[in-house]
């Protein structure tokens, strides 16, 4: 199953498949996910280690037992691969490193005015992985504001050093927010030129694409089918670059397909995993186990359930079936691709989906109405969990926010349907960040249930929390995807970096803002918080947030929308935006229903008919 | 309307007990503390203790010392202080109030005479 | 546990005063002190909570004022009906009432 975990202080002995250099653990964590021999990790922070060659040293480890022993390393962090963990699994990394210059091959340098200039103009490079920039105060001043675009053959940096003054990131390509834009298109009998940067045996031409997408330096791709005329390179998908970024030449060949990277798209990515089942191949592999099992799906189930398996062949020879069960064979390869393909064989075979993004259809658990006021705008895909509650009465508008947390439940606040509990009004947008983007074409979910929490009464403070069954399910995309629930009861999580987040109005006398609004706001105890409300009692079901000069808080219409908190690298909705005395009042925090104390309800409600838990908690 | 009604006067014995009731209306007291205040005779006001109605957890004023007991019944809406061992010195009005972070809202008072 | 000092214990005053009541805790109560206005055979009313935070329905004359363990009431503009015994009240940790100050027409 999907475990995050991470282990502070400790290090994983033995186990070595890759090693690289990463800014951080989270960085380090995320290329384990991808790597398709990685179950764990281990991560050198630079205050961990004096060997300046090992500073942010990033470990990729394998285990035939899925563990290895762990041996105590002040400072270091180690965990698991986020493998099987479905919407968690993404490539976008969006963090920026401060005092760090990540090294590379440095093919672009230019004069920008911040950080976030720099990243955008890395993520409109079609061929820039990482960046650094020298701020206003680096100490050599030519260097000051310079934007210098990088690529490695790994893909990450060649090293990192500590160095005042300077910020570095990565592309935002793996997030679909490149400007560059993308070909969708797959050209028959066509094969493009320049330099293979990898070769590896794929059943189609879509398989080759996702891989090239998902590599680091492949651009372009040709892919040789199963009746190209030399046996030898049938099924070989072929990944390629050039300097330009284009192929230089392509010439016209029969049983050849080329086509793009598919990581230049904007606002979608193609999921990092193969769904599709191949009739009749047998993919070639590393025997990792056999067992007998009711049909070629169960064999793809049986395969994703079990980490290390890349990818399956069910076989229907007779010798190979018992009544109606047949020998399903779980394989591993050293790149993640069968070592070979055949066709005209009795059985059928396809890939893993460990790294789906849409995983299991399950959610991930890990007194006035309130918006957010001394906030800044949000960017695309920052918050994919945010939707926007609107009813459609004679006009159309904002009323609330809420969180998405399953294909189909969002999580929101009681109160938003006080005198409005008829769910055909209702409009839920998700995958937003502008409110004027919605036109009468943009498409909207349809709320199938709403339930209210059985003990929240009307214009009361407690128990402000209630689940919306859509009416379809929502496909998970980078700027659609839910937010992970906490573990039930958790009080032993201190969380210092949280979010509140919503449309509300920015002022307490204003209006529904346009752009989604973002604030970071420190928790504050229940014990100060209920100094602060004389008259309203601060239960262990609440949890507060907010400045003591005032300043930042939620506000009309971000009512039932996240307040978010990042601990180990992983979000989780800690609350829910609730009430509060005015907005952004001095000394008086905004108070949200603690979500962790409703895991039993959330998680009783949202059981599907066949009894089985539509969300789960990271832990 | 908030309103809290206190039950009517008691003149009772040194080393009796009394119980004293605080009924609310125009609001649930699960929904918010009970607080218990005495008023000596001419005298100041002293916190005695806090009850959360919702999971009957109690605080106290640290001298009262066990001669104060706070319960609640969420079913009937009333909130109650038990006083035992009383002396000459438990003479006084008790108040109850509702709130959260302090007394906002307060009950009439009941008087106990302690008396031979 | 926290002492609350109050002074003056009692002070006479006429219609239109402004009249002024103090308060010292022992400790730093980080501006957690509340003040009551009591009437004969009535019980306290609420009238400023954290300070200087005036509660609702309370006359705009009273005010509240100070920091660390030195706090004030004032009453700028003094009306009949403010002739009580007023009262500070901690409640930074647990709850501590000060002696109260008796206000009477001079």
């Known amino acids: 199953g999907c475990l995050t975990q991470l282990y502070e202080n400790a290090f994983f002995r033995g186990g070595d498949v890759a090693s690289m250099y990463t800014p951080n653990a989270q960085y380090c964590q995320m290329r384990c996910t991808f790597h398709p021999r990685c179950l764990l990790f281990s991560f050198l922070p630079a205050s961990s280690i004096n060997d300046m060659e090992k500073r942010f040293g990033c470990f990729l480890k394998d285990s035939v037992t899925g563990t290895l022993p762990k041996v105590h390393r002040t400072g270091a962090v180690s965990g698991h691969s986020l493998k099987q963990c479905g919407h968690q699994i993404s490539a976008c990394h969006r963090d920026i490193y401060k005092g760090v210059d990540m090294r590379g091959v440095n093919f672009n340098v230019s004069k920008v005015s911040s950080v976030e200039e720099c990243q955008k103009r890395c993520t409109s490079n079609i061929r820039c992985q990482f960046f650094s920039y020298a701020t206003q105060t680096f100490h050599k001043a030519e260097y000051r504001n310079n934007c210098l675009l990088k690529y490695s053959p790994g893909g990450t940096p060649t090293a990192i050093k500590v160095l005042s003054n300077v910020e570095s990131g990565f592309s935002l390509k793996p997030c679909a927010l490149s400007e560059i834009g993308c070909h969708m298109n797959i050209f028959q009998h066509l094969a493009f030129s320049d330099v293979d940067v990898a070769r590896v045996l794929t059943p189609d031409a879509f398989v080759c694409r996702t891989i090239c997408t998902y590599h680091p330096n492949c651009l372009f791709f040709t892919f040789y089918t199963n009746v190209w005329k030399i046996e030898s390179q049938r099924n070989v998908c072929l990944l390629k670059t050039s300097e330009s970024g284009t192929p230089s030449s392509s010439t016209p060949q029969e049983n050849t397909i080329s086509g793009y990277s598919l990581l230049t798209c904007k606002r979608t990515l193609p999921e990092p995993c193969h769904s599709k089942i191949y009739p009749g191949v047998d993919f070639g592999g590393e025997e990792l186990n056999v067992t007998f099992v009711k049909g070629v799906n169960v064999c793809q189930e049986t395969c994703t359930k079990m980490i290390r398996c890349q990818f399956f062949t069910y076989s229907l020879l007779p010798e190979d079936c018992k009544e109606e069960k047949c020998k399903c064979f779980l394989r591993l390869s050293m790149d993640g691709s069968p070592t070979r393909i055949a066709y005209g064989t009795q059985g059928s075979s396809g890939y893993s989906l460990r790294l789906c993004n849409t995983g299991d259809n399950s959610v991930c658990t890990t007194k006035t109405s309130t918006r957010i006021v001394g906030g800044t705008n949000s960017s695309w895909g920052e918050w994919p969990w945010q939707v926007s509650l609107q009813v459609k009465l004679t006009a159309q508008r904002h009323l609330c926010g809420g969180s998405l947390i399953g294909h189909q439940w969002v999580l929101t606040a009681a109160h938003c349907f006080d005198g409005l509990p008829l769910q055909d009004v209702w409009r839920i947008y998700s995958g937003i960040l502008n409110l004027s983007d919605i036109t009468k074409d943009t498409p909207f979910s349809q709320i199938k249930e709403i339930i209210i929490h059985q003990n929240y009464k009307v214009s009361e403070g407690n128990h402000d929390i209630a689940l919306i069954k859509l009416q379809a399910p929502l496909n998970y995309t980078e700027f659609q995807k839910p937010i992970c629930l906490p573990s039930k009861g958790d009080t032993s999580t201190i969380y210092t970096n949280c979010w509140v987040t919503g449309w509300g109005f920015s002022k307490e006398k204003g209006e529904i803002q346009n752009i989604l609004q973002k604030v970071n706001i420190p928790l504050v105890t229940n014990e100060e918080c209920q100094k602060r409300y004389q008259d309203y009692k601060i239960t262990q079901r609440m949890v507060c947030a907010g400045y003591k000069e005032g300043g930042k808080d939620a506000c009309k219409g971000d009512s039932g929308g996240p307040l978010v908190c990042k601990h180990n690298g992983m979000w989780r909705l800690v609350g829910i935006t609730s009430w509060g005395e005015g907005c952004a009042r001095r000394e008086q925090p905004g108070v949200y229903t603690k979500v962790a104390e409703y895991m039993d309800w959330i998680l009783e409600k949202t059981q599907s008919s066949d009894g089985k838990a539509q969300m789960q908690s990271p832990a | 309307e908030v309103q809290l009604q206190q039950s009517g006067a008691e003149l009772v014995k040194p080393g009796a007990s009394v119980r004293l009731s605080c009924t609310a209306s125009g609001f649930n007291i699960k929904d918010t503390y009970i607080f218990w205040v005495k008023q000596r005779p001419k005298q100041g006001l002293e916190w005695i203790g806090r009850i959360d109605p919702e999971n009957d957890n109690t605080k106290y004023d640290p001298k009262i010392q066990g001669k104060a007991t706070l319960t609640a019944d969420t079913s009937s809406n009333t909130a109650y202080l038990q006083l035992s061992s009383l002396t000459s010195e438990d003479s006084a009005i008790y108040y109850c109030?509702?709130?959260?972070?302090?007394?906002?809202?307060w009950g009439q008072g009941t008087l106990v005479s302690v008396s031979a | 546990d926290i002492q609350m000092t109050q002074s003056p214990s009692a002070m006479s005053a006429s219609v239109g005063d402004r009249v002024t009541i103090t308060c010292e805790a022992s400790?730093?109560?980080?501006?957690?002190i509340a003040w009551y206005q009591q009437k004969p055979g009535k019980a306290p009313k609420l009238l400023i909570y954290?300070?200087?935070t005036l509660q609702s329905g309370v006359p705009s004359r009273f005010s509240g004022s100070g920091s660390g363990t030195e706090f004030t009431l004032t009453i700028s503009n003094l009306q009949p009906e403010d002739f009580a015994t007023y009262y500070c009240l901690q409640y930074d940790n647990l709850f501590t009432f000060g002696q109260g100050t008796k206000v009477e027409i001079k």
């Open positions: 109030a509702k709130g959260g972070g302090l007394f906002a809202y």
């Open positions: 400790h730093d109560i980080n501006n957690y």
């Open positions: 954290y300070t200087s």
